[in-house]
Interface confidence: medium
């Protein structure tokens, strides 16, 4: 009796750091303006932007949103995880 | 990038820096403060984002006031003290999920805080 | 209160050789690789090297490279130049919205 009373502790715990946790990563990337700067996302080389493409606006928009792109995949699997997680545990119960 | 307004003021006198940039957007980059006492080591003061939210160094947070128009930044110290003395840097602060950086830099504006 | 912890605090390093800077950080940093190092020489403003841990910027000789992952970074300069002596910084960028700097080493070259 006492490891359920464990077990339902430390699952109720490890929600509310998941939640903290992804409280966090979202302030954070808000904070550092979500599609707000330039630059790209994974592989993409260190060359200046301007090598990479010559029209400034195409530049502009393209790399928002790659950024948004990057943040919403960020954000779906940090959040997926943990709605995975809570569809399993609530299936074992 | 280039920081302008650095000079001899006493202690207490407010003081504004203001950076200057060309050839990218303000409403698209973060910009980031980071200052240097003479002989001594870089400190980060803090940035303001592409949506005019600025963030604090935990020490800097009440001493310092960031702010910006379409083309400016600016470094606001209400009340110098002598420990403010240093060369202000002025940086592009760029970022993705992969990656932060401070790939444009200004060459820097001295402020000195003396009686 | 996070703090980052750059050793040698200087170093000395013959043309050809080989230097590493360590930089250590109390907390992971963001993501575990917004890490980022610089290279400062007297007089001037500071130029990024390396960011996200072990991407060379663009114009950097490919003798400097970074590694590790979380707490633990390292600098790595192979085949020293006379114009690698400098102060060099890691800048560690965290989660609470905070930027830390390194306490900086200096760099000789005989």
């Known amino acids: 009796r006492r490891d359920v009373a464990h077990g339902i502790l430390n699952e109720a715990y490890r929600k509310v750091l998941d939640q903290l946790s992804a409280g966090k990563h979202l302030q954070s990337l808000v904070a550092r303006g979500v599609g707000g700067s330039l630059g790209g996302g994974a592989g993409d080389d260190a060359e200046p932007l301007s090598k990479r493409h010559s029209d400034g606006i195409f530049t502009d928009s393209y790399s928002r949103y790659r950024k948004q792109m990057a943040v919403k995949k960020y954000l779906a699997a940090v959040l997926g995880k943990r709605y995975k997680q809570r569809v399993k545990n609530k299936g074992r119960r | 990038v280039e920081e302008s307004g650095g000079r001899l003021v006493t202690p207490g006198t407010p003081l504004t820096l203001t950076c200057t940039v060309s050839?990218?957007?303000?409403?698209?980059?973060?910009m980031c403060w980071v200052r240097q006492a003479p002989g001594k080591g870089l400190e980060w003061v803090g940035f303001i984002n592409s949506d005019d939210s600025a963030y604090y160094a935990s020490w800097a947070k009440g001493r310092f006031t960031f702010s910006k128009t379409s083309t400016t930044v600016d470094l606001k110290i209400a009340s110098p003290t002598t420990e403010d003395t240093a060369t202000y840097f002025c940086?592009?602060?760029?970022?993705?999920?992969?990656?932060?950086?401070?790939?444009?830099w200004g060459p820097g504006t001295l402020v000195t805080v003396s009686s | 209160d996070i703090v980052l912890t750059q050793t040698p605090a200087s170093v000395s390093a013959a043309v050809g050789g080989t230097v590493s800077i360590s930089c250590q950080s109390s907390e992971s940093v963001y993501n575990n690789n917004y890490l980022s190092w610089f290279q400062q020489k007297p007089g001037q403003p500071p130029k990024l090297l390396i960011y996200g841990a072990s991407t060379l910027a663009s114009g950097v000789p490919s003798r400097f490279e970074g590694s590790g992952s979380g707490t633990q970074f390292t600098l790595t300069i192979s085949d020293v130049q006379c114009d690698d002596a400098a102060t060099y910084y890691c800048l560690g960028d965290y989660i609470i919205i905070e930027n830390i700097f390194g306490g900086g080493t200096e760099v000789v070259v005989k």
């Open positions: 050839g990218f957007s303000l409403s698209t980059y973060n």
């Open positions: 940086a592009r602060y760029d970022w993705d999920y992969y990656y932060s950086r401070l790939d444009l």
